[in-house]
Interface confidence: medium
């Protein structure tokens, strides 16, 4: 089951899965110039049994010629607004979720990709959040969004993460950036777009993690 | 089940000081910011103060700033509000929040009433 | 410090009634907004957050839309459990700011 939002927004933070469960969708985008090859996938699938997990199809994308009307896959400005891309500074791995039996892991890149990975999650995805540079968090532990199905319909679970200036002490963000539409009340139709911006996993972990800038919920 | 109740609440006269309490419990409060809102009677709500988990990052309305406090103490699930130099327009009604989220969870409310 | 302007300030409406309350931030907030009802005595419960998100557990007949300095809270079909007052809260900057607040009353 697709979740049918995306996960919610924090003022100066970013998320980061760790991991994909199986069923998870990331759309084959092609940087401007580039299109997707005309017998390409639209899309690779996380896929898999109870011991093995991959990546099913393949991204290819080839030169656009100059007289290409063919719209950019790359998002153009106007479209961007719509999406949310997170950009991580150096993200932390709580858990190696990537061996966990039903997840995969980060996909490699392929040639000419776009810098925007557009990624549709299903219900049980986790993501992690944590401050960009120059931000700290006023909670502690690991601030993090489940996808959960509550009476047939999605909703993400709200990290509780505060991320505040360091320098800027008169400046005090807030919580969650708007989704596009109410947890279960669509107001309009709102597709399932997830991007991150060249998030290529990092695997080892945070030599910060005892001062993890992660929040966690309430236990 | 989470669970604020603020103390210390009265009457006070101008210039003088009260400190108010806000006994938390029902999640892990050595891991939450957490704020003062105040509301004085018959009227709207304002933030006073907020503070980080570890009490390293404090933020003050202008309205309080150099007169009142915020602080914590993580071991015994308290958070303070110490106020000092008291004047009229600080009566009010104030509440102790969890400032994850902007005010998800609130206490009932404690009113200090400035007097002479 | 942004300003928060709710209008109107106090509404009578009745049981079924569609009631629209509306909130002018004094500068852009990005939708970094919260609002909130309030019941004599009692502490504010917040309904909805980030301009539109419904807080878990608030009736679906609430509903938030808006952007940029305007927001607007809808209750699509007033229930009697719904009269009290209202306040808009803009998060994007330090110190968060309320609006003075819409007392909706039964008409």
């Known amino acids: 089951e697709l979740c049918d939002d995306d996960p919610p927004e924090i003022p100066h933070a970013t998320f980061k899965a760790m991991a994909y469960k199986e069923g998870t969708m990331l759309n084959c985008e092609c940087k401007r110039g580039f299109r997707r090859i005309k017998s390409g996938s639209l899309y690779m699938l996380c896929t898999g049994n109870s011991s093995h997990s991959s990546w099913d199809n393949q991204c290819q994308c080839t030169s656009s010629a100059t007289r290409n009307t063919t719209k950019q896959v790359t998002p153009q400005p106007e479209e961007q607004k719509e999406r949310k891309t997170t950009e991580m500074q150096s993200p932390m791995q709580p858990v190696d979720q990537a061996s966990l039996p039903g997840h995969c892991r980060e996909p490699p890149p392929w040639e000419n990709e776009a810098t925007e990975r557009i990624y549709h999650f299903v219900v049980g995805q986790m993501v992690y959040y944590q401050c960009v540079q120059g931000y700290r968090a006023l909670h502690r532990g690991p601030a993090e969004s489940v996808c959960k199905m509550t009476h047939g319909k999605t909703r993400w679970t709200q990290p509780q993460l505060i991320c505040t200036g360091e320098m800027e002490t008169s400046q005090f963000p807030g919580e969650e950036k708007p989704q596009a539409s109410p947890e279960g009340r669509p107001e309009s139709e709102t597709s399932c777009l997830v991007t991150t911006t060249d998030f290529q996993i990092q695997t080892e972990m945070a030599a910060t993690m005892e001062t993890s800038i992660f929040t966690t919920e309430y236990q | 089940q989470v669970q604020l109740v603020e103390s210390g609440g009265g009457v006070v006269q101008p210039g003088r000081s009260l400190r108010l309490s806000c006994a938390a419990s029902?999640?892990?409060?050595?891991?939450?910011?957490m704020a003062w809102v105040r509301q004085a009677p018959g009227k709207g709500l304002e933030w006073v103060a907020v503070?980080?988990?570890?009490?390293?990052?404090?933020y003050y309305a202008d309205s309080v700033k150099g007169r009142f406090t915020i602080s914590r103490d993580n071991a015994k699930n308290t958070l303070y509000l110490q106020m000092n130099s008291l004047r009229a327009e600080d009566t009010a009604v104030y509440y102790c929040?969890?400032?994850?989220?902007?005010?998800?969870?609130w206490g009932q409310g404690t009113l200090v009433t400035v007097s002479s | 410090d942004i300003q928060m302007t709710q209008s109107p300030s106090s509404l009578s409406a009745s049981v079924g009634d569609r009631v629209t309350i509306t909130c002018r931030a004094s500068?852009?907030?990005?939708?970094?907004l919260n609002w909130y009802q309030q019941k004599p005595g009692k502490a504010p419960r917040r309904l909805i957050y980030?301009?539109?998100s419904l807080q878990s557990g608030v009736p679906s007949r609430f509903s938030g839309s808006g952007s940029g300095t305007d927001y607007t809270l809808t209750i699509s079909s007033l229930q009697p459990e719904d009269f009290a007052t209202y306040y808009c809260?803009?998060?994007?900057?330090?110190?968060?700011?309320f609006g003075q607040g819409t007392k909706l009353e039964i008409k």
């Open positions: 929040t969890t400032g994850w989220n902007s005010g998800y969870d």
């Open positions: 029902g999640f892990t409060f050595s891991n939450h910011a």
């Open positions: 503070i980080s988990y570890d009490g390293s990052n404090k």
């Open positions: 500068q852009s907030i990005s939708s970094y």
């Open positions: 980030g301009t539109n």
């Open positions: 809260q803009q998060y994007n900057s330090w110190p968060w700011t």
